[in-house]
Amino acid sequence: SERCDDWGLDTMRQIQVFEDEPARIKCPLFEHFLKFNYSTAHSAGLTLIWYWTRQDRDLEEPINFRLPENRISKEKDVLWFRPTLLNDTGNYTCMLRNTTYCSKVAFPLEVVQKDSCFNSPMKLPVHKLYIEYGIQRITCPNVDGYFPSSVKPTITWYMGCYKIQNFNNVIPEGMNLSFLIAFISNNGNYTCVVTYPENGRTFHLTRTLTVKVVGSPKNAVPPVIHSPNDHVVYEKEPGEELLIPCTVYFSFLMDSRNEVWWTIDGKKPDDIPIDVTINESISHSRTEDETRTQILSIKKVTSEDLKRSYVCHARSAKGEVAKAATVKQKVPAPRYTVELACGFGAT
C-alpha cells in the first residue's frame, strides 16, 4: 500500500472510559495533528477510516459497525460506543485518506470498571477551590455532545459513596455543584451521574473529579523569608563547615512559579570558585501553601569565604524578596600565656 503519514501512538491521549457507559471519542488527527477540520477534509473528498488492535494482540482489524443496536458507530469524526464493553480496550486508529493522501494516528482506549462507590483505576482531574472564598462551582465534566439540548437529563451528585443532600455548604444545582464556602473537609472525590434517555434506552454517564481546597488569593502575600534573619549570626572558624538555611514561605497562587536561590557576592554559587552545595526540601500546608528550604553548605570554610556576602532570594507571582545572612569569622579566645602576658609587658 502507498505511504501514509503515521503519527504513531498518541499516548498523550490516554483515554479511559467506564464499562457499560456511552463513550464518544473524537479522532485526534483534527485536534492535534492536522491544520484542518473534519468538515474541510470531508468536502475535499477525504474518507475517515477506523480500525483497532485488541489488547495484547498485534493484529489490526476493522471495527465492527454492524453490532446489535448499533453498539459501535461512527458519526463524522466521532467514534461512538453505546455502551462500552470491557473487551473494547485496545489501540484505536483513525486514518484519513484518498487516492493521493493518507494520514493516521493511533490512541489507547481503556475501558475500566468501577465499584458501587465509583472507585476505579480512572485518572481523576483535580479541581482547585479557594478556601473560604465565597460561592464556587464545579461542573460535571465531559458530558457535551452526548444528548441534544432538548433532552433534560437527571443529575445526581455524590461525595465519595454518598449522595449529596442536606450538606450544609454543598448544594447540587443540575450540572453544577455549588460550594457556598469551601473548607479543608470538602477535600475529596465528587461524582456526578448523568442519566438520559435515547431511543427507548437509558444511559448513564459517570464523571468523578477530585476537589482540592487551596489557599485563597485574598490571603496571598509576597514570599516571606524566615531564615536567614537578623537574630542569627553564623560565626565560624576557618576549616569548619558553614551551613546556612534559607527558609521561605510562599502563599498558594494558581499557576505561580515559586523560586528560591542563593547569591554569593552577587553571583550564582556555580559562578564562584568555591565548593558549595545546595540542598532543597519542600513542604506544603493543607491548602498547598509552600515552604521551601535551601541549605547552603561549604564543607571547609576559608577566612576569605567568611568575608563574602551570602544572600537568599525568593520570587513568586506576588513579588521578589531577598535577605542577607550575617556571616562572621569567630575570634579565637585569647590564650593567657601569650596574648595576655604581652599586655603586661612580658617579652
Epitope: E132, N168, F183, I184, N187, N219, Y249, S285, R286
Partner: antibody, heavy 119, light 108 residues
C-alpha cells in the same frame, strides 16, 4: 445542637491498646472532620490526627503514625481512635473535636476520656 | 512542623483589666488558619477565635484576635471573673496541627 459524647475512662497496662469512641448526636456527622487531641496531666494540648468520615480520609501526626488508627462508622455517627503499644507517657485525657461546619477550626469538643496507663 | 510559642506563660491581672496574650509561629501560618481556645480547669477547650480574628458562635465581643504571618494576639478588653483560665493558640493550616504551650490568666 450537635454534641460529641465520648466513652468512659480506661485503665490500661503498658503494651496494650485502647479504643476511645466519640458519638455525634443532634446533627450531620459524616461531612465534617473529627480530630483527636490529647492532654497529659498538667500539660498542654497535642493534636493526634483526624478523619473525614464521608470520604474516609485520615491523617495523623508523625509521632503517632505507627501506633494510631482512626476510623469512623457512619451508620452509628461514631468516630474511633485506637492507640496501641501504650506506655505510661500516654496517660492523658483524650478529646475528640469536630471541624468543618462553620470553619476548619475545632468548634465542638467531646467531654474527654481519661486513659491511665499503669502497671 | 510549625512551632507556636505563647507568652507570657502566666498573666496575673484583676477583673476589669485588659489582657493581651501573644502567640508567635516559627513559620507563616497558612491561610490565616490560627485559632484561640479557652480551657477552664476540668473542662474541654472551647473555641473563642478562628481565622485569626473571627469570633466563634456565642463568644462575647470582649474577646478579639489580630495578627498575621507569624505574630498573633488575643485581647480580652475587660476581664470578667469567668475569663480566668488557660488560653491556647492553634494553627490548623499545616499538618501536623499544632498548639501553643498555653498562657494562664490568673487573678492578681
Amino acid at each position: 445542637q450537635v454534641q460529641l459524647l465520648q466513652s468512659g475512662a480506661e485503665v490500661k497496662k503498658p503494651g496494650s491498646s485502647v479504643k476511645v469512641s466519640c458519638r455525634a448526636s443532634g446533627g450531620t456527622f459524616s461531612i465534617y472532620a473529627i480530630d483527636w487531641v490529647r492532654q497529659a496531666p498538667g500539660q498542654g494540648l497535642e493534636w493526634m490526627g483526624g478523619i473525614i468520615p464521608i470520604s474516609g480520609t485520615e491523617n495523623s501526626a508523625q509521632n503517632f503514625q505507627d501506633r494510631i488508627t482512626i476510623t469512623a462508622d457512619k451508620s452509628t455517627n461514631t468516630a474511633y481512635m485506637e492507640l496501641s503499644s501504650l506506655r505510661s507517657e500516654d496517660t492523658a485525657v483524650y478529646y475528640c473535636a469536630r471541624n468543618g461546619a462553620t470553619s476548619d477550626a475545632f468548634d465542638i469538643w467531646g467531654q474527654g476520656t481519661m486513659v491511665t496507663v499503669s502497671s | 512542623e510549625i512551632v507556636l510559642t505563647q507568652s507570657p506563660g502566666t498573666l496575673s491581672l484583676s477583673p476589669g483589666e485588659r489582657a493581651t496574650l501573644s502567640c508567635r509561629a516559627s513559620l507563616s501560618v497558612s491561610s490565616n488558619y490560627l485559632a484561640w481556645f479557652q480551657q477552664r480547669p476540668g473542662q474541654a477547650p472551647r473555641l473563642l477565635i478562628y481565622g485569626v480574628s473571627r469570633r466563634a458562635t456565642g463568644i462575647p465581643d470582649r474577646f478579639s484576635g489580630s495578627g498575621s504571618g507569624t505574630d498573633f494576639t488575643l485581647t480580652i478588653s475587660r476581664l470578667e471573673p469567668e475569663d480566668f483560665a488557660v488560653y491556647y493558640c492553634q494553627q490548623y493550616g499545616s499538618s501536623p496541627l499544632t498548639f501553643g504551650g498555653g498562657t494562664k490568666v490568673e487573678i492578681k
